[in-house]
């Protein structure tokens, strides 16, 4: 068990703060909830603190919750591939470029670390080149979320990882908006981290609303499990 992994044996409170600017539309989001890495479970509620969110909530899911991949459930035989927990408590910087097919792009940068007993995800997001009446600024996405696989590989040169995946957002007319994600994570501290073999995270997310919440918001339930590495030969012959 890495030192960081010991911090995730129970339920951990999560705080998310995001400041965004998409095509000059500025907004802030605050999120609170908890994570339980034993089950790979996240429960979070996000509120736009600046009024109405100028982009669809589903376009921010990866920035919020795929930002705290340290809550992913890594099976026993894969624990030595869990970069995310090993970087704690100092944490990691997570940078992404997200290309929305036939539309603009988000550039995000987050610092994910423990502050006391709380796991904090602080994010800056800059979006450019979006069409004012496209699927994103035109709010044409359905309020739901598909399951995805998130592919992880070591980046030895930067003592971190590189991550690639394609998100499929459902559009109201029945078609799909693709969002290509290019991600890199580097540790904030200078302690040792686990550099993984290639594997993936299997994610399932459910979006809902709080009937008592008047502000623009999103409630998120998510389950994430690591997969893609089989038991070693010594395991097979036990």
């Amino acid at each position: 068990m890495s030192k960081g992994e010991e911090l995730f044996t129970g339920v951990v409170p999560i705080l998310v703060e995001l400041d965004g600017d998409v095509n000059g539309h500025k907004f802030s989001v605050s999120g609170e909830g908890e994570g339980d890495a034993t089950y790979g479970k996240l429960t979070l509620k996000f509120i736009c603190t600046t009024g109405k969110l100028p982009v669809p909530w589903p376009t921010l899911v990866t920035t919020f919750s795929y930002g705290v991949q340290c809550f992913s459930r890594y099976p026993d035989h894969m624990k030595q591939h869990d970069f995310f927990k090993s970087a704690m408590p100092e944490g990691y910087v997570q940078e992404r470029t997200i290309f929305f097919k036939d539309d603009g792009n988000y550039k995000t940068r987050a610092e994910v670390k423990f502050e006391g007993d709380t796991l904090v995800n602080r994010i800056e997001l800059k979006g450019i080149d979006f069409k004012e009446d496209g699927n994103i600024l035109g709010h044409k996405l359905e309020y739901n979320y598909n399951s995805h696989n998130v592919y992880i590989m070591a980046d030895k040169q930067k003592n971190g990882i590189k991550v690639n995946f394609k998100i499929r957002h459902n559009i109201e007319d029945g078609s799909v908006q693709l969002a290509d994600h290019y991600q890199q994570n580097t540790p904030i501290g200078d302690g040792p981290v686990l550099l993984p073999d290639n594997h993936y995270l299997s994610t399932q997310s459910a979006l809902s609303k709080d009937p008592n919440e008047k502000r623009d918001h999103m409630v998120l339930l998510e389950f994430v499990t690591a997969a893609g590495i089989t038991h070693g030969m010594d395991e097979l012959y036990k």
């Epitope: 400041d19 802030s28 550039k107 940068r109 602080r122 800059k126």
Partner: nanobody, 121 residues
């Protein structure tokens, strides 16, 4: 806050802004740049005021720490394990908005007058 120091030594720079520079949403990015003789001005570190998120050039990562006191409107740069190649004139700079897209000197409209840091071997 500049000065002369032996290689391996430490220095702390500070920069006080006379007014709060921000956009209409109260967002503000402050950074440190440096310029060695005959070279272009280069980014050292920057900090986004509202969230406290920080950015560092690869050459100073793990040695330098940027911080700010929002109440005093003051920016700091703590420098450890200094090397002769850190010798330069150091400038603080500020701009309203996010930090994520403020990478080059031309992104910053407000500048301090600069302080000399000399590291001898």
């Amino acid at each position: 806050g500049g000065g002369s120091v032996q290689a391996g030594g430490s220095l702390r720079l500070s920069c006080a802004a006379s007014g709060y520079i921000s956009d209409s949403h109260g967002r503000n990015c402050m950074g440190w740049f440096r310029q060695a003789p005959g070279k272009e001005r280069e980014a050292v570190a920057r900090i986004y005021s509202r969230l406290g998120t920080t950015y560092y050039a690869d050459s100073v990562k793990g040695r330098f720490t940027i911080s700010r006191d929002n109440a005093k409107n003051t920016l700091y740069l703590q420098m450890h394990s200094l090397k002769p190649e850190d010798t330069a004139m150091y400038y603080c700079a500020a701009v309203g908005g996010l930090c994520i897209d403020k990478e080059t000197p031309t992104d910053y409209p407000f500048w301090g007058q600069g302080t000399q840091v000399t590291v001898s071997s």
